[in-house]
């Protein structure tokens, strides 16, 4: 995997220094590498029953490098594991492991769910929704005149998206029927919204529900609607970042 | 449950020797190197030696050569630190680690006071 | 042997407040850092391996950042059981040293 292989070499007695190839500063016929040149890491490959020195530049995939003052030496990590900062931390598992907290395991522990893409487990992320905005004006085919019964939307924003196991998003349209004041079209009003409305109570039997709109009427799981809007959001930032205690390194 | 408990701390005068024990247990004692970290009072934290698993190596800090042995015992699970010529600066609570490039095991410490 | 230089040395901060404690080391050690706290009376405890790995155990609260020379250890929303001294440390090669240490008070 790595350059600068340093490899034994035919009719070599052992502990004899002259004739190593590559990396090795020390070799031996049967042993391969004893020692390597400086900034190589020392490593043991198993080759069938015997371990043979090799000098790298850096530790195999893995192994993980010590550097002493005497000697750059790379040293096995756990069976599971690809990449590790030492025997107890992993950083990387190999295939079909996932990594969490140093550990390598088969699957992610209750309240996590496995990232495919960096192999980690990661916490699971519910979808959280804004306030809903305020209701549309009361129209009907794009117009605020000219009819009574029409209906008003509102909206409300994804915040944050769910990850593969988190809450789905509830509606984020809704839509209910309404009446306004009948009144005629102005000239040059006709298919235009307007802003203001009167609006009269429902007529008996007449429903003023909201009802989600069609478009969002996904398969959903419910959530709390107890968000915060966003002007309480911003004031909080704002205050969290009053709070702040800052050091900045002194170069 | 890892455990590292240190022993033999006391109080020496300058010029004299003391000898440091580090009894594991809870983990594989031979997998690891393992060190003896310092703390004078109210100071920060100096590494003072590290002797490699199998204990065919010990490497120590410059201000301790030759005046310090590092040597364990692995079939004991025990980890020793031979102090001779000790001096007031030597004085300070010293922990035993498990040391693998990070220091992932820590003793209680034992306090190590020079003074005449 | 290599310098770690930690900032600031000590350091008063209030229950909720975001804390970053920094340390700069005096060549490239890569992502080779640790992170530990230590309480009063007590031995460290690793917090943070490997510049910004979280060790088991502890609080989320915790970040580690940084590589190169110039690292970061930030506690998002200080408790009351955070207050305690800090110390870094290379683990990129021997001798092993750390940071001097940083002392969390309460304001």
């Known amino acids: 995997q790595n350059a600068s292989r340093g490899r034994r070499q035919r009719r070599m007695h052992p502990n004899v220094s002259q004739g190593c190839q590559g990396g090795c500063a020390t070799c031996s016929d049967y042993n391969g590498c004893l020692s390597c040149k400086p900034r190589l890491f020392f490593a043991l490959e198993r080759i069938g029953m015997k371990q043979i020195g090799v000098c790298l530049s850096s530790c195999p995939s893995g192994y993980y490098g010590t550097r002493y003052p005497d000697i750059n030496k790379c040293t096995k990590c756990k069976a599971d594991c690809d990449t590790c900062f030492n025997k107890n931390f992993c950083t990387k598992c190999k295939s079909g492991f996932y990594l969490h907290l140093g550990k390598c395991l088969d699957n992610c522990p209750e309240g996590l769910e496995a990232n495919n893409h960096t192999m980690e487990c990661v916490s699971i992320v519910h979808c959280e929704v804004s306030e809903w905005n305020p209701w549309s004006p009361c129209t009907k085919k794009g117009k605020t005149c000219g009819f009574k019964r029409g209906t008003e939307t509102r909206v409300r924003e994804i915040i944050q998206h769910p990850s593969a196991k988190g809450n789905l998003c509830p509606p984020t349209n809704e839509t209910r029927k309404c009446t306004v004041q009948r009144k005629k079209c102005q000239k040059g009003e006709r298919g235009k919204k307007g802003r203001e409305r009167k609006r009269k109570k429902p007529n008996k039997g007449e429903s003023k529900e909201a009802i989600p709109d069609s478009k969002s009427l996904e398969s959903s799981k419910e959530i709390p609607e107890q968000r915060e809007n966003k002007q309480q959001q911003k004031k909080r930032k704002v205050q969290d970042k009053q709070k702040s205690v800052s050091v900045s390194t002194v170069h | 449950e890892v455990q590292l408990v240190e022993s033999g701390g006391g109080v020496v005068q300058p010029g004299r020797s003391l000898r440091l024990s580090c009894a594991a247990s809870g983990f594989t004692f031979s997998d690891y190197d393992m060190a003896w970290v310092r703390q004078a009072p109210g100071k920060g934290l100096e590494w003072v030696a590290t002797i490699i698993y199998d204990g065919s190596r010990t490497y120590y800090r410059d201000s301790v050569k030759g005046r310090f042995t590092l040597s364990r015992d692995n079939s004991k699970n025990t980890l020793y630190l031979q102090m001779n010529s000790l001096r007031a600066e030597d004085t300070a609570v010293y922990y035993c680690?498990?040391?693998?490039?990070?220091?992932?095991?820590w003793g209680q410490g034992t306090m190590v006071t020079v003074s005449s | 042997d290599i310098q770690m230089t930690q900032s600031p040395s000590s350091l008063s901060a209030s229950v909720g407040d975001r804390v970053t404690i920094t340390c700069l080391a005096s060549?490239?050690?890569?992502?080779?850092l640790v992170w530990y706290q230590q309480k009063p009376g007590k031995s460290p405890k690793l917090l943070i391996y490997?510049?910004?790995r979280l060790q088991d155990g502890v609080p989320s609260r915790f970040s580690g950042s940084g590589s190169g020379t110039d690292f970061t250890l930030t506690i998002s929303s200080l408790q009351p059981e955070d207050f305690a001294t800090y110390f870094c440390q290379q683990s990129y090669k021997y001798l092993p040293t750390f940071g001097q240490g940083t002392k969390l008070e309460i304001k």
């Open positions: 490997a510049a910004s």
């Open positions: 680690a498990a040391h693998d490039r990070s220091f992932d095991y």
């Open positions: 060549e490239d050690i890569s992502n080779d």
